[in-house]
């Protein structure tokens, strides 16, 4: 006999990176017939929703109108059908941005390189910070963490055309409070190669989450997004 129901999906709309004072909605999708959804924040009950009518609703939304550092952290949700509870969802890391100045991102040897050339990104923020994050825009999104008082380096190693794209970085005092994003740096990788064994295994977002984040920061628009598998979230841990 089944003791628990399948875990629900949890995600943030329009994005898990939320500029301070902007709105965000945490979505939890379980099953039709669920009579109660609970949202947990940092291990404690945060909010409850009881959909009506439960048999016609399989998703609830928890609205945060004004993002701040106290609201940033790890969220999960569960749901109940009758007396039976689900497994908890994966953890959603909700990040507040614009909590520190804008870092500077540079790339060596330069923004245009040859396939196989070793490339290193440098993220610099003169105000005190301890952690830096490098993000690549688009569907194939690579998130790296680096440490340093004012600068972190992110060696990509020998690059291939799969590394082409636009990168930004953030400074961070902790996992969930990030700076403004840096100006973008576009990496161009040129050169025909016979050996393609160096293609990187980039973690993937099923949606262009960066575009969504930019919508959030620039216009505050809501944009529906495909459910994702929390690859990016896991990279933050």
């Amino acid at each position: 006999q089944q003791q628990t129901l399948p875990k629900p999906f949890i995600w943030a709309e329009p994005h898990f990176m939320v500029p301070k004072e902007k709105q965000v909605t945490i979505c939890c999708q379980g099953n039709y017939g669920a009579v109660e959804y609970q949202l947990h924040f940092e291990g404690s009950l945060f909010a409850v929703d009881r959909p009506k009518p439960p048999e016609r609703i399989n998703k609830v939304k928890f609205y945060i109108p004004d993002m701040n550092s106290r609201m940033a952290g790890q969220y999960s949700c569960i749901y109940r059908v009758g007396e039976l509870w689900s497994e908890p969802s994966n953890l959603l890391d909700l990040v507040v941005t614009e909590m520190a100045d804008t870092p500077t991102l540079s790339v060596h040897p330069g923004p245009e390189v040859i396939s196989g050339e070793k490339v290193t990104f440098y993220c610099r923020l003169d105000t005190a910070t301890s952690m830096f994050l490098l993000l690549k825009e688009g569907r194939s999104s690579h998130v790296q963490r680096g440490y340093g008082k004012v600068q972190a380096e992110f060696p990509l190693g020998p690059v291939t055309t799969a590394h082409r794209g636009t990168y930004r970085c953030f400074g961070s005092a902790n996992n969930h409070a990030w700076s403004f994003p840096s100006e973008p740096v576009k990496l161009l990788v040129t050169g025909d190669i016979e050996n393609t064994s160096l293609a990187p295994e980039d973690p993937t977002f099923p949606a262009d989450t960066w575009g969504t984040y930019l919508l959030t920061t620039e216009t505050g628009l809501q944009k529906d997004h495909a459910l994702w598998d929390h690859t990016a979230q896991n990279l933050l841990r």
Partner: antibody, heavy 116, light 107 residues
């Protein structure tokens, strides 16, 4: 100590080909791309192209596509540039240069004279 | 292609002078700008990388500044051995391009 040792001067006839070498030492050859630069007499520097020794990726200045071919021999840590269908316009000093961000180390140059 | 324009073409100086050499890129190249010195019958030698970063073994009288499209190489007290041609180089985009050079000569 990083060193880039180029082959000696060449005197060749128009229409011929020539292959210039750049033997490196003092660093790991596959860690840096190798580039070639042309300097005609009394003129500035012109980038011909570059190659990454680890996987053979190349990038050429459009002006030199079809004229220059860059290759490497990892076993001897040597880079090569072949120039074909030579004319008097190709007479110049050719340098190999390691790209460590900037061109941080240069060969001593190879003088190519194309004359009948 | 990014065009690098250097001025002046020739600079006549007296030892001890402070001199500034200018380099302008036809579009913004951030700080991906490198400076080289070439003495007569020698290979170019790297002086400054990334617009302002000093190079080990290069005398401290050489310094670089600028960002975007305007850059300057300064020599704060010229020595006789500084005679030669100075080139700036775009390190931002392929094709990598050099300026036409500034010839530094003694009066």
């Amino acid at each position: 100590e990083v060193q880039l040792q180029q082959s000696g001067p060449e005197l060749v006839k128009p229409g011929a080909s020539v292959k210039i070498s750049c033997k490196t030492s003092g660093y790991t050859f596959t860690e840096y791309t190798m580039h070639w630069v042309k300097q005609s007499h009394g003129k500035s520097l012109e980038w011909i192209g570059g190659i990454s020794p680890n996987i053979g990726g190349t990038s050429y200045n459009q002006k030199f596509k079809g004229k220059a071919t860059l290759t490497v021999d990892k076993s001897s840590s040597t880079a090569y540039m072949e120039l074909r269908s030579l004319t008097s316009e190709d007479s110049a000093v050719y340098y190999c240069a390691r790209r460590g961000g900037s061109f941080d180390y240069w060969g001593q140059g190879t003088t190519l004279t194309v004359s009948s | 292609d990014i065009v690098m324009t250097q001025s002046p073409a020739t600079l006549s100086v007296t030892p001890g002078d402070r001199v500034s050499l200018s380099c302008r890129a036809s579009q913004s190249i951030s700080d991906y700008l490198h400076w080289y010195q070439q003495k007569s019958h020698e290979s170019p030698r790297l002086l400054i990388k990334y617009a302002s970063q000093s190079i080990s073994g290069i005398p401290s009288r050489f310094s670089g500044s600028g960002s975007g499209s305007d850059f300057t190489l300064s020599i704060n007290s010229v020595e006789p051995e500084d005679v030669g041609v100075y080139y700036c180089q775009n390190g931002h985009s392929f094709p990598l391009t050099f300026g036409a050079g500034t010839k530094l000569e003694l009066k």
